[in-house]
């Protein structure tokens, strides 16, 4: 007996071939011997089966001795043994229809769990193997679970259901609601304008919710809310903003924040949270601000950085066109009685410059002694 696997909602062709390549009598019946369809002259006739309105046959193939039955919009309960009667012989085809669905909405927040449930006909013992877009493999029986969804799990999951050495493939689109980056750092010289961007790692027709940016300045003892906003159909509206700093926010997605100028007192790290309508939990993105200042005071040239920097970052003071360099894995570096010329303050990570600031040191002439 031939076994054919089908997918719920799909269309399947059950083949039945006669030895003679000509138009002949044929009938398709179910296991209860109820006629589904057949031929009467050149007319396709339908029987009293529940399947009849969804069953069809291709007249153009009858002349080739092919008397297939096509079943549209498959249901789990269509699983049965079907009998094709042609040329005084009977061909049996066992049809097994499976359905694979996500238990919840397929738009899930990062960290949430995904459960896939397999619908299968009674008496079957299928196995399921799923592969995520990122190459993660999960397998199971009637249910499959992915405990903690990650950003890279977004996309089309390919699931293979196996039964009696036959397979049928399902594709399920999963959208993991998260920002493109978990964390980002902005490096700025003192006084420069700062741009924070929070691009989502997903696209939705409608995006509605509310969000807030909390900020922990390095110099402050506690964090404070810098801005709160609403999101309605991808339109951003600010609800409340602090007076210092006076942040500006873009009206369209991706979420975009502008700090008029980078100052040492703003250096630190923030956490932007976004609560989406009809979703439990929140999207998070951490953002860091590192501010650099280079100053000359009397005989001292100083370069400082504020904000969350890694201990492996190097801070250097370097005289342009000369070999003079002072470097430290610290947040401040200085030179006493610096030579005249253009000095560069550099913050670098393994040779890659993250931030630089130039300061001109003018020659100091000794003050003439008063007679």
């Amino acid at each position: 007996k031939k076994v054919v696997l089908g997918k719920k909602g799909d269309t399947v062709e059950l083949t039945c071939n006669a030895s003679q390549k000509k138009n002949t009598q044929f009938h398709w019946k179910n296991s209860n011997q109820i006629k589904i369809l057949g031929i009467q002259g050149s007319f396709l006739t339908k029987g009293p089966s529940k399947l009849s309105d969804r069953a069809d046959s291709r007249k153009s193939l009858w002349d080739q001795g092919c008397f297939s039955m096509i079943i549209k919009n498959l249901k789990i309960e269509d699983s049965d043994t079907y009998i094709c009667e042609v040329e005084n012989k009977k061909e049996e085809v066992e049809l097994l229809v499976f359905g694979l669905t996500a238990n919840s909405d397929t738009h899930l927040l990062e960290g949430q769990s995904l459960t896939l449930t397999l619908e299968s006909p009674p008496g079957s013992s299928p196995s399921v193997k799923c592969r995520s877009p990122g190459g993660k493999n999960i397998q199971g029986g009637r249910t499959l679970s992915v405990p903690q969804l990650e950003r890279q799990d977004s996309g089309t999951w390919t699931c293979t259901v196996s039964q009696d050495q036959k397979t049928v493939e399902f594709k399920i689109d999963i959208v993991v609601l998260a920002f493109q980056k978990a964390s980002s750092t902005v490096y700025k010289k003192e006084g420069e304008q700062v741009e924070f961007s929070f691009p989502p790692a997903f696209t939705l027709e409608k995006l509605t919710g509310s969000g807030e940016l909390w900020w922990q300045a390095e110099r402050a003892s506690s964090s404070k809310s810098w801005i709160t906003f609403d999101l309605k159909n991808k339109e951003v509206s600010v609800k409340r903003v602090t007076q210092d700093p006076k942040l500006q926010m873009g009206k369209k997605l991706p979420l975009h924040l502008t700090l008029p100028q980078a100052l040492p007192q703003y250096a630190g790290s923030g956490n932007l949270t976004l609560a989406l309508e009809a979703k439990t939990g929140k999207l998070h993105q951490e953002v860091n601000l590192v501010v650099m200042r280079a100053t000359q005071f009397q005989e001292n040239l100083t370069c400082e950085v504020w904000g969350p920097t890694s201990p492996k970052l190097t801070l250097s003071l370097k005289l342009e066109n000369k070999g003079t360099t002072v470097s430290k894995q610290a947040k401040a570096v200085w030179v006493l009685n610096p030579e005249a010329g253009m000095w560069q303050c550099l913050l670098s990570d393994s040779g890659q410059v993250l931030l630089e600031s130039n300061i001109k040191v003018v020659p100091t002439w000794p003050t003439p002694v008063q007679p």
């Epitope: 050149s42 007319f43 396709l44 069809d56 291709r58 007249k59 002349d63 096509i70 079943i71 549209k72």
Partner: antibody
Amino acid sequence: QVQLQQWGAGLLKPSETLSLTCAVYGGSFSGYYWSWIRQPPGKGLEWIGEINHSGSTNYNPSLKSRVTISVDTSKNQFSLKLSSVTAADTAVYYCARVINWFDPWGQGTLVTVSS
Amino acid sequence: DIQMTQSPSSVSASVGDRVTITCRASQDISSWLAWYQHKPGKAPKLLIYAASSLQSGVPSRFSGSGSGTDFTLTISSLQPEDFATYYCQQANSFPYTFGQGTKLEIK
């Protein structure tokens, strides 16, 4: 709701090979046959051929020697290749789903053969 | 090949008119016939299949009849959106063939 979206080169020189692809979205790919039909300017519709998900084909005898229809089930796509084209192959080419009747159809692609 | 012949090749009518288009097959095709509506720049649309079955979503003013070699498409009361070219198609045997079309124009 099943939708068919087609694409391919619109301008060819005589003797070149016409190549079109049709992608099936939002519906079943298996169980159906997938056809190519063309309509030369100011003329009627002409069936070119068909394929099913397992690669079984039927072609119009008038074009059989020049036609190849192939299928890529992993992408729910099927393609048409028509070799050694002449000006007589200038037409709007349509892809369509078929059991016995053509429904739905792709949006059509105008292919012009000109030297 | 089965030849499909439509008549008339064009017809002029007014909104509200009853219009009949005929299609003749060169051999018996039982009821393996479909009717399509085709508008310029659009894809053809299935109206009637199996000679007389109305495709889902098609207005009931369209009807089909016939069996064997002679078939008819009737539009009971023409609407402005019905002005188009109509084709019949046989699904009895390969190659599938279409009628040459009937252009329905506004009088």
